[in-house]
C-alpha cells in the first residue's frame, strides 16, 4: 500500500481467483484514543472500534472510502483504491491502447519544434467518475524538470457503438536546450483512477523522435509564361523553431489529381519552392520535415491547381 | 579545414559531408537485421557515447562566439563512433550483407573527422567504451541502439555545418 | 516445416569418438544458429555448444576441448564430434535451432526428437 | 557460469488452479534492458518446448494460460488455470552469457 495523495492510498493486488488479498491497517488521524468507530462509504454499517482498523482487501467491494468517527463527528478519511496485477501485468483496463506506432501504446505524444514543449493525449470510452493526473521529467534517475498542466477532455467520437474520449495535456521543459543533442528521454507518467480503480500509464521518448512540424505556411502557385508549369512557394510553419539556417526543414511537394487512383508526381527539395506540373483538376500539397533526422512529416498544406 | 587555434572549417564540404552521414545513418538502420528487442531494451547505452551537450556551444550564439569548442566536441564523436563501427559489435556475428550501407557511414565518419582536423594536430578523443556483447543478439542489439544514437549525433552536427555554412563561410 | 533430425551412433565405447549429424530442413543454416543440448536419463538439460550463421562456435567450457561444431550449409547439416567418450556422456543429444538473433534472444525454437546414445564397453 | 535455481523441485496443483515456479540466476541475465531468460515445457518422451521468450513473450500456438514475468536475476512462470495437459517438467534457460544454462527444473503434477 502507498500514498498517492493526501488521505488517498493505492493497494496493490495480485488478481487471481482467490488471491488471498492483501491486509492493510487503516490509522485514524485524531489525537483520540477512545470510542473510535469505523465506516465504509455511505453506509452506517460499524466495521470496527478503535484507533487501527485492520482490513482484508481482497476486491473492489473493500475498497473505497474509509470514515473514523467519534460520538458522530467525523475524525478523518482513507480512501482506498486497487492496483490490478494479472499473470504479473498491471491492468490497463482505463486507457485505449492506440496500437500506434506499436501495440500497447496507450500515450502518444508530439512536438511542434525542439523547444522543449509537447502534447500528449490518450483515448478512453469512460465517461464519467474519471480524473488523471500527468507528471513527467527529463530522466529518470536525477530527474529534470518538466512542468505539465491538467489533462483536459480535448475531443468526443462514436467508434460503431461506443463513444470515444481523448484526452489532452501540454508539457513544457523548464530549462529546454533546443541545439542539444538528447542524452536522457523526457519521461510522462499518467495516474488514471476511475471510480475505486487505480492505474497508471508511462511513456518515454527523446523529442526528436516526436518532432511533427505543422504544415508549411503561405503555399502559393505562380504560373509560368507559356508552359504548364507551376512555381510553388511556401514558407516555413511559424511554430518551427529558429533560425531555419540551424533547423532546417526538408519538403515534398506533391501533384494529385482528383481520382485517389491517379498517379501522384512527387518532389523532394530542400528549398521552399518548386516547379511542377499543374493537371487540370489537380491539387498541389507540400509538406515538411526535420531536414536531418527523420521524424514524422507535417500534415499536408494544400492549393488546387486551378 | 579546422586548423588548431582558431581558423574555419570548411564549412561547406562538412555541410555536405554530414547531411550525407545522416542519409547513411537512417538507411543502415533497419538494414542491420529483423529486431524486436529494441522495442524493449531500454537507452542505457546512451550514457556510454559522447553527446553534444548544451554547454558545447554548438548552438547559433555558441558558433558564432567560438565554433571551435563545437567543432572539437563533434571531432570527438566521429571518432568515437568510427572506432565503434569498426569494432567486433559490427563486423563479428551476425555478419553484415556486403552491401551494408555501414561500411559507407564508416568511411564517411572518418572522412568528415578527417576534414575537420588535419594530419600533425590531436584534439583529445574519448575512449571507447567496454559494452562486451558475447551474443549474436547482444551485437544485434547494440548495432540499433549506436545507430539511434550515431542519426542523433549527425543531425546536430549537421546542422552545426548547414548553420556555419550559412551564416560563418567567409 | 521446420524440422531438425539426428542421426549417429546408438552404441560407443569408452574413449571412442562420437560423431552425430543433424539434418535440418523449412530453413537455412545461413539464417539460423544450431545448438546443441543433451539430457542423461533422468536428469535436466546441459547445452554443449552453438554454431553461428557465419560459422564461428562457441562450447561449454566443461567439455570444450573434447567437441567440435561444424556443419555445411549446402547439405542443410550440422556436425556435432565429441572425443574421448565416458560412460557419464550417456545421454540423450538434441539438436535444436536458435530462435531469430533479433527476436529471440537466444531462445530454442525448434528442438529435433534426440537420439540416446550409450556410452559402454 | 550462471547458475539458475528453480523452486519448487515439484509441485502440486488442482485442475483449474494457478500454478507458479520461480527461477533465480546467480547474476543478472539482462543486457541492455532486454532479459535473456526463455522458458521450455517438457512432458515424458518428447524433446522441451519453448513456451516464453524473453521473459513474458508468449511463444506463437502455446495457450494463454502461460506466462512470464521478472527481470534481471529473479523470472517467474505462471500458468493461471492448471490443465491436465501441462503436467510436464519446465525449465528456465538463459543465453546471456556463455556457456548457455538450464534450470535443474520443477514437475508440475495433479493435485
Known amino acids: 500500500i502507498w500514498e498517492l495523495k493526501k488521505d488517498v492510498y493505492v493497494v496493490e493486488l495480485d488478481w487471481y481467483p482467490d488471491a488471498p488479498g492483501e491486509m492493510v491497517v487503516l490509522t485514524c488521524d485524531t489525537p483520540e484514543e477512545d470510542g473510535i468507530t469505523w465506516t465504509l462509504d455511505q453506509s452506517s454499517e460499524v466495521l470496527g472500534s478503535g484507533k487501527t482498523l485492520t482490513i482484508q482487501v481482497k476486491e473492489f467491494g473493500d475498497a473505497g472510502q474509509y470514515t473514523c468517527h467519534k460520538g458522530g463527528e467525523v475524525l478523518s478519511h482513507s480512501l482506498l483504491l486497487l492496483h490490478k496485477k494479472e499473470d504479473g501485468i498491471w491492468s490497463t483496463d482505463i486507457l485505449k491502447d492506440q496500437k500506434e506506432p506499436k501495440n500497447k501504446t496507450f500515450l502518444r505524444c508530439e512536438a511542434k519544434n525542439y523547444s522543449g514543449r509537447f502534447t500528449c493525449w490518450w483515448l478512453t470510452t469512460i465517461s464519467t467518475d474519471l480524473t488523471f493526473s500527468v507528471k513527467s521529467s527529463r530522466g529518470s534517475s536525477d530527474p529534470q524538470g518538466v512542468t505539465c498542466g491538467a489533462a483536459t477532455l480535448s475531443a468526443e467520437r462514436v467508434r460503431g457503438d461506443n463513444k470515444e474520449y481523448e484526452y489532452s495535456v501540454e508539457c513544457q521543459e523548464d530549462s529546454a536546450c533546443p541545439a542539444a543533442e538528447e542524452s536522457l528521454p523526457i519521461e510522462v507518467m499518467v495516474d488514471a483512477v476511475h471510480k475505486l480503480k487505480y492505474e497508471n500509464y508511462t511513456s518515454s521518448f527523446f523529442i526528436r523522435d516526436i518532432i511533427k512540424p505543422d504544415p508549411p505556411k503561405n503555399l502559393q502557385l505562380k504560373p509560368l509564361k507559356n508552359s504548364r508549369q507551376v512555381e510553388v512557394s511556401w514558407e516555413y510553419p511559424d511554430t518551427w523553431s529558429t533560425p531555419h539556417s540551424y533547423f532546417s526543414l526538408t519538403f515534398c511537394v506533391q501533384v494529385q489529381g482528383k481520382s485517389k487512383r491517379e498517379k501522384k508526381d512527387r518532389v523532394f527539395t530542400d528549398k521552399t519552392s518548386a516547379t511542377v506540373i499543374c493537371r487540370k483538376n489537380a491539387s498541389i500539397s507540400v509538406r515538411a520535415q526535420d531536414r536531418y533526422y527523420s521524424s514524422s512529416w507535417s500534415e499536408w498544406a494544400s492549393v488546387p491547381c486551378s | 579545414r579546422a586548423v588548431p587555434g582558431g581558423s574555419s572549417p570548411a564549412w561547406t564540404q562538412c555541410q555536405q559531408l554530414s547531411q550525407k552521414l545522416c542519409t547513411l545513418a537512417w538507411s543502415a538502420h533497419p538494414l542491420v537485421g529483423h529486431m524486436d528487442l529494441r522495442e524493449e531494451g531500454d537507452e542505457e547505452t546512451t550514457n556510454d557515447v559522447p553527446h553534444i551537450q548544451c554547454g558545447d556551444g554548438c548552438d547559433p550564439q555558441g558558433l558564432r562566439d567560438n565554433s571551435q569548442f563545437c567543432l572539437q566536441r563533434i571531432h570527438q564523436g566521429l571518432i568515437f563512433y568510427e572506432k565503434l563501427l569498426g569494432s567486433d559489435i559490427f563486423t563479428g556475428e551476425p555478419s553484415l550483407l556486403p552491401d551494408s550501407p555501414v561500411g559507407q557511414l564508416h568511411a564517411s565518419l572518418l572522412g568528415l573527422s578527417q576534414l575537420l582536423q588535419p594530419e600533425g594536430h590531436h584534439w583529445e578523443t574519448q575512449q571507447i567504451p567496454s559494452l562486451s556483447p558475447s551474443q549474436p543478439w547482444q551485437r544485434l542489439l547494440l548495432r540499433f541502439k549506436i545507430l539511434r544514437s550515431l542519426q542523433a549525433f549527425v543531425a546536430v552536427a549537421a546542422r552545426v555545418f548547414a548553420h556555419g555554412a550559412a551564416t560563418l563561410s567567409p | 516445416q521446420v524440422t531438425l533430425k539426428e542421426s549417429g551412433p546408438v552404441l560407443v565405447k569408452p574413449t571412442e569418438t562420437l560423431t552425430l549429424t543433424c539434418t535440418v530442413s523449412?530453413?537455412?543454416?545461413?539464417?539460423?544458429?544450431i545448438s546443441w543440448v543433451r539430457q542423461p536419463p533422468g536428469k535436466g538439460l546441459e547445452w554443449l555448444g552453438v554454431?553461428?550463421?557465419?560459422?564461428?562456435?562457441n562450447y561449454n567450457s566443461g567439455i570444450k576441448s573434447r567437441l567440435t561444431i561444424s556443419k555445411d550449409n549446402s547439405k542443410s547439416q550440422v556436425v556435432l564430434t565429441m572425443t574421448n567418450m565416458d560412460p557419464v556422456d550417456t545421454a540423450r543429444y538434441y539438436c535444436?535451432?536458435?530462435?531469430?538473433?533479433?527476436?529471440?534472444?537466444?531462445?530454442?525454437?525448434?528442438w529435433g526428437q534426440g537420439t540416446t546414445v550409450t556410452v559402454s564397453s | 557460469d550462471i547458475v539458475l535455481t528453480q523452486s519448487p523441485d515439484s509441485l502440486a496443483v488442482s485442475l483449474g488452479e494457478r500454478a507458479t515456479i520461480n527461477c533465480r540466476a546467480s547474476?543478472?541475465?539482462?543486457?541492455?534492458?532486454?532479459?535473456?531468460m526463455h522458458w521450455f515445457q517438457q512432458k515424458p518422451g518428447q524433446p522441451p518446448k519453448l513456451l516464453i521468450y524473453?521473459?513474458?513473450n508468449l511463444e506463437s500456438g502455446i495457450p494463454a494460460r502461460f506466462s512470464g514475468s521478472g527481470s534481471r536475476t529473479d523470472f517467474t512462470l505462471t500458468i493461471s488455470s492448471l490443465q491436465a495437459e501441462d503436467v510436464a517438467v519446465y525449465y528456465c534457460?538463459?543465453?546471456?552469457?556463455?556457456?548457455?544454462?538450464f534450470g535443474g527444473g520443477t514437475k508440475v503434477e495433479i493435485k
Open positions: 524473453r521473459a513474458s
Open positions: 534457460q538463459q543465453a546471456n552469457k556463455d556457456p548457455y544454462t
Open positions: 547474476e543478472s541475465v539482462d543486457y541492455y534492458g532486454i532479459s535473456s
Open positions: 535444436v535451432r536458435e530462435g531469430d538473433y533479433g527476436s529471440y534472444a537466444g531462445a530454442m525454437d525448434y
Open positions: 523449412g530453413f537455412s543454416l545461413t539464417n539460423y544458429a
Open positions: 554454431i553461428w550463421t557465419g560459422g564461428g562456435t
